[in-house]
């Protein structure tokens, strides 16, 4: 969370930004806010790269103008233009791509006054792993598989009963380049596992920690899976 | 509400130049959230989009067309225009100008279209 | 460039039925693609954008679905003036780019 102030005069406002990371390949926001003003046409909202000429996005008199923004950017940043009215200054950012990783500013500048925050914006690969039992290996045992990581993440295994235990020696661990040789695919198989047991299959790069859970019994089998971004907020 | 009207000849020679023109009527071609493009048509063919502009006039080019493609504006007429150079007759197809979305860039509305023959 | 495939090439489907089209994409385009709709003689129609919105003044009959690779188009009862060709397209990332078109006609 960073906030900052600005000063016009007597008048100052306040913009807040948060830290994110972006998903390569998919779509993310770059988040902003600032004090609200409801004169929509008295708003400029300026958001900008640390290294690069040029705006990644510009909002004013109640429109877009992108007549100054970088080649990088074209036609892939958009506001959320109904809400910068009550202080949304958010950005929409299409195909997020490893290079839009970086140092952001959002400027805003109103009838109460200006004021700018930077945003720290990380870009990588993250995605849900997914627990099976693997029918195919000659002893009982589980397999793990996330379709997209970047940077290249760690992989551990854990199960409630054997609280503690390295399974480092009874797992064996892949990774696969995707055909657009950035991201990989993660596959982790863990051997000799017993029944009524819960394991827990986590991968974890400096962007995001994945958990993937799975209790095999008699008669079912449950999975849970769920994702955090790290640093983020 | 907004129509574009393409104009320009039907029939362009070999090796020649093709030229067209958009007019948008109902709306100014200076809108800051859409670009202006174009796209083609081949007699009983699929769609290929071939670019678009900005009313400050940064342009982007399908690679594949890149070499022989321009783009311009001209913002006091409201509006932009293509030429596409050494034709051959892969080129003759319908040719419509759009207005395109900045972000999510959708292609709405389009003008009615105009068929381009490329023969001698 | 991302290479957008749709099938099938012709659907034959009687007034009043259920129409199902499918688009898909060589690689992930998110939720970046649209329908058009278009009748002989005239320009393609923008129907649905965001893979899942309809365009103003589109029927609600009109429907898509999708995201990443698999989209869908799905026109819950075939009217009269629905007869025509559909295109998907994606604009995820330059160069845009148009699948080959599913024709819908009267069985």
């Known amino acids: 969370l960073i906030i900052g102030f600005g000063i016009s005069g007597k008048h100052f406002i306040t913009v807040t930004t948060f830290t994110s990371a972006g998903n390569i390949g998919e779509d993310g926001t770059l988040s902003c806010t600032f004090e609200p003003d409801i004169k929509l046409n008295g708003i400029v909202i300026q958001w900008l790269k640390e290294g690069i000429k040029g705006l990644v996005h510009e909002f004013k008199e109640g429109k877009d103008d992108l007549s100054q923004q970088h080649e990088m950017f074209r036609g892939r940043t958009a506001v959320f233009a109904d809400q910068v009215v009550v202080g949304n200054a958010s950005l929409r950012l299409k195909n997020v791509q490893l290079t839009d990783a970086g140092t952001y500013t959002c400027y805003i500048r109103t009838s109460k006054g200006k004021g700018n925050a930077n945003l720290e914006y990380k870009t990588g690969a993250f995605s849900m792993p997914e627990i099976n039992v693997d029918y195919n290996a000659s002893s009982e045992s589980l397999r793990c598989e996330a379709p997209r990581w970047f940077p290249q993440p760690t992989v551990a295994w854990a199960s409630q009963v054997d609280q503690g235990a390295n399974f480092s020696e009874v797992s064996n661990t892949s990774f696969e380049l995707n055909s657009e040789n950035v991201t990989m695919k993660v596959v982790s198989v863990l051997y000799n596992v017993t029944i009524n047991n819960t394991y827990s299959c986590m991968i974890e790069n400096d962007i995001a920690k994945a958990t993937g859970d799975i209790k095999v019994t008699d008669s079912e089998v449950k999975r849970r899976s769920q994702l955090q971004l790290l640093n983020s907020g | 509400q907004l129509q574009l009207q393409e104009s320009g000849p039907g029939l362009v020679k070999p090796s020649e130049t093709l030229s067209l023109t958009c007019t948008v009527s109902?709306?100014?071609?200076?809108?800051?959230?859409?670009?202006w493009g174009w796209i083609r048509q081949p007699p009983g063919k699929g769609l290929e989009w071939i670019g678009n502009?900005?009313?400050?006039?940064?342009?982007y080019y399908n690679p594949s067309l890149k070499s022989r493609v321009t783009i311009s504006v001209d913002t006091s007429k409201n509006q932009f225009s293509l030429k596409l150079s050494s034709v051959t007759a892969a080129d003759t197809a319908v040719y419509y100008c759009?207005?395109?979305?900045?972000?999510?860039?959708?292609?709405?509305?389009w003008g009615q279209g105009t068929l381009v023959t490329v023969s001698s | 460039e991302i290479v957008m495939t749709q099938s099938p090439a012709t659907l034959s489907v009687s007034p009043g039925e259920r129409a199902t089209l499918s688009c898909r994409a060589s690689?992930?385009?998110?939720?970046?693609l649209a329908w058009y709709q278009q009748k002989p003689g005239q320009a393609p129609r923008l129907l649905i954008y965001?893979?899942?919105t309809r365009a103003t003044g589109i029927p609600a009959r009109f429907s898509g679905s999708g995201s990443g690779t698999e989209f869908t188009l799905t026109i819950s009862s075939l009217q009269s003036e629905d007869f025509a060709v559909y295109y998907c397209?994606?604009?995820?990332?330059?160069?845009?780019?148009f699948g080959g078109g599913t024709k819908v006609e009267i069985k």
């Open positions: 965001g893979a899942s």
């Open positions: 690689q992930s385009v998110s939720s970046n």
């Open positions: 502009i900005y009313y400050s006039g940064s342009t």
């Open positions: 397209q994606q604009y995820h990332s330059f160069p845009f780019t």
């Open positions: 759009a207005r395109e979305g900045s972000y999510p860039n959708w292609l709405d509305p």
């Open positions: 109902g709306g100014s071609i200076k809108s800051g959230s859409h670009y």
